[in-house]
């Protein structure tokens, strides 16, 4: 029950996180005009990953897309790439995790397969969250650098008479949405990985049936495979048949949870 709850919660948290990553990526307010200690202008500038906008006091907002690809800063391209990778991984992760949910029955899917899929989606969510956090952090770092650079020469005087005000940009709402969303996706991914451990059964100990030969204490299997002495041998990834005499544990062979790490 706890496993199902953990898996379900992980899925929901990741879903919210990925929705947030998509929202942040589409938002126009990645950077907004810094209003502190600035002359009061009747125009408010803000920029996103895909376009820049200007909101006039009179009520008009005009947005212009970045129609160039080669002319854009490499850092902006990198942030775009990170966010898109995050969204794609997250979307695939969501798709995989839907089928992995313990509460959803799809044919005769084994718990081992569900555990495997849960782990896969969990890892995808973790990478997706990290991509979003990295993308937002790279953009934030870019803003901080540009902010202090523009502060250094905020007023570029022309003969001391005419002044040009340089627009400084600070963190926009999208950055905070991105950080929170990335964090949620990451947490959701961790929860899925934890749920995977509960879904996968404990390591199967295939109990060999001993055929005691006189004077030997070594268990033999038909087919020429030599089993290790005693019981509880780790038959990692090998299904050993005992010629029809098998214990209850061996009716179905489960992969070890460590096989998919």
């Amino acid at each position: 029950m706890a496993v199902t709850a953990c898996q379900g919660l992980g899925f929901v948290v990741s879903l919210i996180g990925i929705a947030g990553i998509i929202a942040a990526t589409c938002m126009d307010q990645w950077s907004t005009q810094d209003l502190y200690n600035n002359p009061v202008t009747a125009v408010f500038n803000y920029q996103g990953l895909w376009r820049s906008c200007v909101r006039e006091s009179s009520g008009f907002t005009e947005c212009r897309g970045y129609f160039t690809l080669l002319g854009l800063p490499a850092m902006l391209q990198a942030v775009r790439a990170l966010m898109i990778v995050g969204i794609v991984l997250g979307a695939i992760g969501l798709l995989v995790s839907i089928f992995a949910l313990k509460c959803i029955r799809i044919g005769s899917m084994e718990d081992s397969a569900k555990a495997n899929m849960t782990l896969t989606s969990g890892i995808m969510f973790i990478v997706s969250g990290l991509c979003a956090i990295a993308g937002v952090s790279v953009f934030a770092n870019m803003l901080v650098t540009n902010f202090w650079m523009s502060t250094a020469n905020m007023y570029t005087g022309m003969g001391g008479m005419v002044q040009t005000v340089q627009t400084r940009y600070t963190f926009g709402a999208a950055l905070f949405v991105g950080w929170v969303a990335g964090g949620l996706t990451l947490i959701g991914g961790v929860m899925m990985c934890i749920a995977c451990r509960g879904l996968a059964p404990e390591e199967t100990n295939y109990k060999a049936v001993s055929y005691h030969a006189s004077g030997h204490s070594v268990a033999y299997k038909p087919g020429g495979f030599k089993a290790s002495t005693g019981f509880g041998s780790n038959t990692k990834n090998k299904k050993i048949y005992d010629g029809g005499a098998r214990t209850e544990d061996e009716v179905q062979s489960y992969p070890s949870k460590h096989d998919y790490v």
Epitope: A42, V43, N45, S58, V162, T164, V165
Partner: antibody, heavy 117, light 113 residues
Framework: QVQLKESGPGLVAPSETLSITCTVS????????VQWVRQPPGKGLEWLGA???????NYNSALMSRLTISKDNSKSQVSLKMSSVTAADTAIYYC???????????WGQGTLVTVSS | DIVMTQSPSSLAVSLGERATMNCKSS????????????LTWYQQKPGQPPKLLIY???TRESGVPDRFSGSGSGTDFTLTISSVQAEDLAVYYC?????????FGQGTKLEIK
């Protein structure tokens, strides 16, 4: 079509408060801002202030202490109040709608306010 | 506050001639976000309220004859009437629409020779 009409007292005694109402039609005050401009007889234009769609206001720094601009969206009315008036405040007062580039694209006909005892 | 200086204060031209008036601001009115200059030109005929001619320094308001054109960027702006008509007799004002408080120039009076 867009229309703005100012209505004022015409005559105000010195040190009193001047109150003018601008009634608009053809557009919504929740979408567009309204600006106020005055013109003393035979002189140039002077920007007084503005109230924007969101309700935020900006004022002429020289008159800020005496000016108050407010609006009633439901009545489509914007009001300008100026306290402690003097003869220097005698002017034609215009209200105008904010347009592209924060320019004033539609103007009222103006109302002449004379400050005299 | 931003100071707007218009020159000349009055201008006399013959009908059909070209009229050019200037406006200078104490600070750049260019917004880096959209590369637009927030300077507006108004025309005021005697006994009438002002009329919007040009916004964003060079964009003509709808219904304004194409003989009116605006140019300039940053701090220096020009209003040109390519062929002056009798109905163009008016005072022309430039306005800073970028920094609060918005400020007007003192006006240029266009007279017919």
């Amino acid at each position: 079509q867009v229309q703005l009409k100012e209505s004022g007292p015409g005559l105000v005694a010195p040190s009193e408060t001047l109150s003018i109402t601008c009634t608009v039609s053809g557009f919504s005050l929740t979408t567009y801002g309204v600006q106020w401009v005055r013109q003393p007889p035979g002189k140039g234009l002077e920007w007084l202030g503005a109230i924007w769609a969101g309700g935020n206001t900006n004022y002429n720094s020289a008159l800020m202490s005496r000016l108050t601009i407010s609006k009633d969206n439901s009545k489509s009315q914007v009001s300008l109040k100026m306290s402690s008036v003097t003869a220097a405040d005698t002017a034609i007062y215009y209200c105008a709608k904010g347009g592209y580039g924060n320019a004033m694209d539609y103007w009222g006909q103006g109302t002449l306010v004379t400050v005299s005892s | 506050d931003i100071v707007m200086t218009q020159s000349p204060s009055s201008l006399a031209v013959s009908l059909g001639e070209r009229a050019t008036m200037n406006c200078k601001s104490s600070q750049s009115l260019l917004n880096s976000g959209n590369q637009k200059n927030y300077l507006t030109w108004y025309q005021q005929k005697p006994g009438q309220p002002p009329k919007l001619l040009i916004y964003w320094a060079s964009t003509r308001e709808s219904g304004v004859p194409d003989r009116f054109s605006g140019s300039g960027s940053g701090t220096d702006f020009t209003l040109t009437i390519s062929s002056v008509q009798a109905e163009d007799l008016a005072v022309y004002y430039c306005q800073n629409d970028y920094f609060f408080p918005f400020t007007f120039g003192q006006g240029t009076k266009l007279e017919i020779k």
